[in-house]
């Protein structure tokens, strides 16, 4: 893989991770609970990420081709010296599926990424059964190992799981914030060497990387901050009880001074940046009904106002192996009548405070095309069409038949596989179209199957506007207009002239324009004009006319 100039100025084929903010590096992960209902919002399960004893980094095995759970589950072991990768640690691409990840591990920073290599080492670890979103949105891989900006301590002595634990039926919802360690510009990693005469650390150092879980009370609309510490700490002004700070208002900062007899001054001053109320966000299905068979749209909606800076709120989605960092996502090319699950989370100041899983079933798709078996006319006024129904779900059929510019459509029962067309016009080409349709969120029409036939011939209708006029004493001029319905392939006009019961003339022309000469004077004649279409003669139009006495 050739080196590629990265957006951050690095030259590497595997783009190093760039933190989304200047927040300290994460040392914990939060497991995402699987959705088991159509829509479960703010419903989470607490999961502890156990690290492999020999490595500071573990990686979730791919769950399926979709990699629905393929996030790196990473953290820093409390007794391990972080492993800084060398060239030998370059990631070998898996021959199998992707493991897309929101974040890597603090220990996985590479001091000098080599162009053309990868900036993270992948160590197979435990397999997680649920998709996991790391709590912090950053992938903390930078060209230098930056730890903290306000402490000289090395990596944290303990890695807490930062989770949001809730049951939607409970009054409490759990949100989380993390304060992690970041020594000032130093890339020194401490080892596990234990001094023989350890001095007490300062409380500021000891609790430098303290993590906090925010529990939200839906009734009081207040938060409780739970301090994730092993011992019962003391807070200045007695603001905490049993390591909990109560009655915190959303979107307000609170300062807590933390001390304990195991550490010395200065105390740890913890700023609690309280997130917005969880119920102020709703994951909304924004799919257009017309496209709901093959697309999904999901959008986080702010259903109530709050005073937190919306710039500090970030959104994430994962659907299968696709990750999004938008408030709204649209997926296309989906299968109709199929269930899809998307996991989403909202972060405040880069710390997750709520999440939701949504299972959406795409709408019924357009039915397939019926298969026409035959389509023919066996009579002048009738036709028949038979078909096999499409495979996909449908409600009914629409059969349309078009002659010239005239179109008639019929709604047919879904169980029909044959239809007899009646009252058709003889010797007429009919184009038939048959499609199935389904009434879903909207009516969706399937592709139409087409066929055509020409009805059989029938006797033509009568000629009309027939006239007989005398052109001379013994000559007549007979004219008529064509029949309204020819009903056959050919066009021929016939004229029969009778005197009494005797046929005296029988002529046939392409046009209805006959000049009859040399008739007897002063004789009554019967003129019969009719149309013949090649198969059938029409009804004759009959007129009587007499010749006059010869004028000479």
């Amino acid at each position: 893989q050739s080196p590629t100039p990265s957006p951050t100025g690095l030259t590497t084929a595997k783009m190093p991770s760039v933190p989304l903010s200047s927040d300290p590096l994460p040392t914990h992960t939060t497991a995402f609970s699987p959705a088991s209902t159509f829509e479960r919002e703010n419903d989470f399960s607490e999961t502890t990420t156990s690290l492999s004893p020999d490595n500071t980094s573990t990686q979730v095995s791919p769950d399926s081709l979709d990699n629905a759970s393929a996030f790196n589950t990473t953290g820093v072991s409390s007794v391990q010296t972080p492993h800084l990768p060398t060239h030998a640690d370059s990631q070998t691409p898996s021959a199998g599926t992707d493991t897309q990840t929101f974040s890597g591990s603090a220990a996985n920073a590479k001091l000098n990424p080599t162009p053309g290599s990868n900036a993270i080492s992948d160590v197979p670890g435990e397999r997680s059964t649920a998709s996991t979103f790391p709590t912090d949105p950053v992938s903390p891989l930078t060209t230098t190992l930056s730890l903290a900006h306000h402490s000289s301590a090395a990596l944290p002595a303990r890695t807490s799981n930062t989770t949001i634990t809730a049951n939607t039926s409970d009054a409490y919802l759990n949100a989380s914030e993390t304060t992690t360690l970041s020594p000032s510009g130093s890339a020194v990693i401490s080892t596990t060497t234990i001094a023989t005469t350890p001095s007490k650390p300062t409380c500021d150092e000891k609790y430098a990387n303290i993590t906090v879980d925010y529990l939200y009370n839906k009734e009081t609309k207040l938060f409780t901050a739970k301090l994730n510490v092993n011992e019962n700490v003391e807070c200045g002004n007695n603001t905490c009880t049993n390591n909990e700070v109560h009655n915190l208002t959303e979107c307000k900062n609170a300062s807590v001074s933390i001390s304990h007899n195991s550490c010395t001054a200065p105390d740890k001053t913890l700023i609690l940046d309280v997130p917005p109320g969880v119920e102020k966000f709703q994951l909304h299905d924004c799919t257009q009904v017309e496209k709901a068979d093959t697309t999904i749209c999901l959008k986080w909606k702010n259903i109530e106002t709050f005073t937190c800076d919306t710039q500090n709120i970030t959104y994430r989605f994962q659907c299968g192996n696709m990750i999004f960092d938008n408030k709204e996502i649209k997926l296309e090319n989906l299968e109709p009548e199929h269930e899809y699950k998307c996991d989403s989370e909202i972060l405040y100041n880069n710390h997750k405070f709520t999440n939701a899983s949504k299972i959406i079933k795409t709408d019924f798709g357009s039915p397939g095309e019926p298969q026409i078996i035959f389509c023919r006319s066996e009579a002048a006024h009738q036709g028949v069409i038979t078909w096999n129904p499409p495979q996909r779900s449908f409600h009914n059929f629409t059969l349309c038949y078009i002659k010239e510019t005239e179109k008639d459509c019929l709604n047919l029962d879904k169980n029909l596989i044959k239809y007899d067309l009646q009252n058709l016009k003889p010797y007429t080409k009919y184009v038939l179209s048959l499609h199935a349709y389904i009434i879903a969120k909207v009516q969706r029409n399937g592709s139409a199957a087409m066929c055509h036939f020409t009805t059989k011939s029938a006797p033509p209708s009568q000629v009309w506007n027939m006239t007989v006029s005398m052109t001379s004493d013994n000559s007549m001029h007979v004219k008529c207009r064509p029949p309204r319905d020819r009903n056959g392939p050919h066009e021929r006009y016939h004229l029969e002239v009778e005197a009494g019961n005797t046929l005296v003339r029988n002529e046939s022309h392409k046009n209805c324009d006959f000049r009859v000469k040399d008739l007897q004077y002063s004789t009554d004649y019967t003129f019969k004009a009719y149309f013949h279409n090649g198969d059938y003669p029409g009804e004759p139009f009959i007129l009587h006319h007499s010749t006059s006495y010869n004028s000479k």
Epitope: D66, D98, Q100, S103, N118, S139, M322, I323, K341
Partner: nanobody, 124 residues
Framework: EVQLEESGGGLVQPGGSLRLSCAAS????????MSWVRQAPGKGPERVSI???????????SYADSVKGRFTITRDNARSTLHLQMNSLKPEDTAVYYC??????????????WGQGTQVTVSS
């Protein structure tokens, strides 16, 4: 070794079309989520399109609002090739276009592989 090689970039007039291709090797292409990411001069990277799989359905796509209805991402698993059909091009589409194995986001960069990019310039 993962290799991604883009082609098909060039100079085109506004309203014109281009088809970018990305030849992939060194990994199982059909199982992988793939993206097109562009970077205009002086701007951050923007993922314009992604193709992946969700719930057993492969070939699922998504587009940035800025290109929706104009760009189409497709993949040819038999040839391990990713395509981006770009129609109705605008001057603001001018950028280097990268083929990415992965999601092509800041947050996923650690596990993404990027090609070297192909320049697309839309100008009259």
């Amino acid at each position: 070794e993962v290799q991604l090689e883009e082609s098909g970039g060039g100079l085109v007039q506004p309203g014109g079309s281009l088809r970018l291709s990305c030849a992939a090797s060194g990994f199982t292409f059909s199982n992988s989520v793939m993206s097109w990411v562009r970077q205009a001069p002086g701007k951050g990277p923007e993922r314009v399109s992604i193709i992946g799989s969700v719930g057993g359905t492969s070939g699922v796509t998504s587009y940035a609002d800025s290109v929706k209805g104009r760009f189409t991402i497709t993949r040819d698993n038999a040839r391990s090739t990713l395509h981006l059909q770009m129609n109705s091009l605008k001057p603001e589409d001018t950028a280097v276009y990268y083929c990415v194995k992965g999601n092509g986001l800041t947050s996923t960069r650690a596990s993404d592989y990027w090609g070297q990019g192909t320049q697309v310039t839309v100008s009259s």
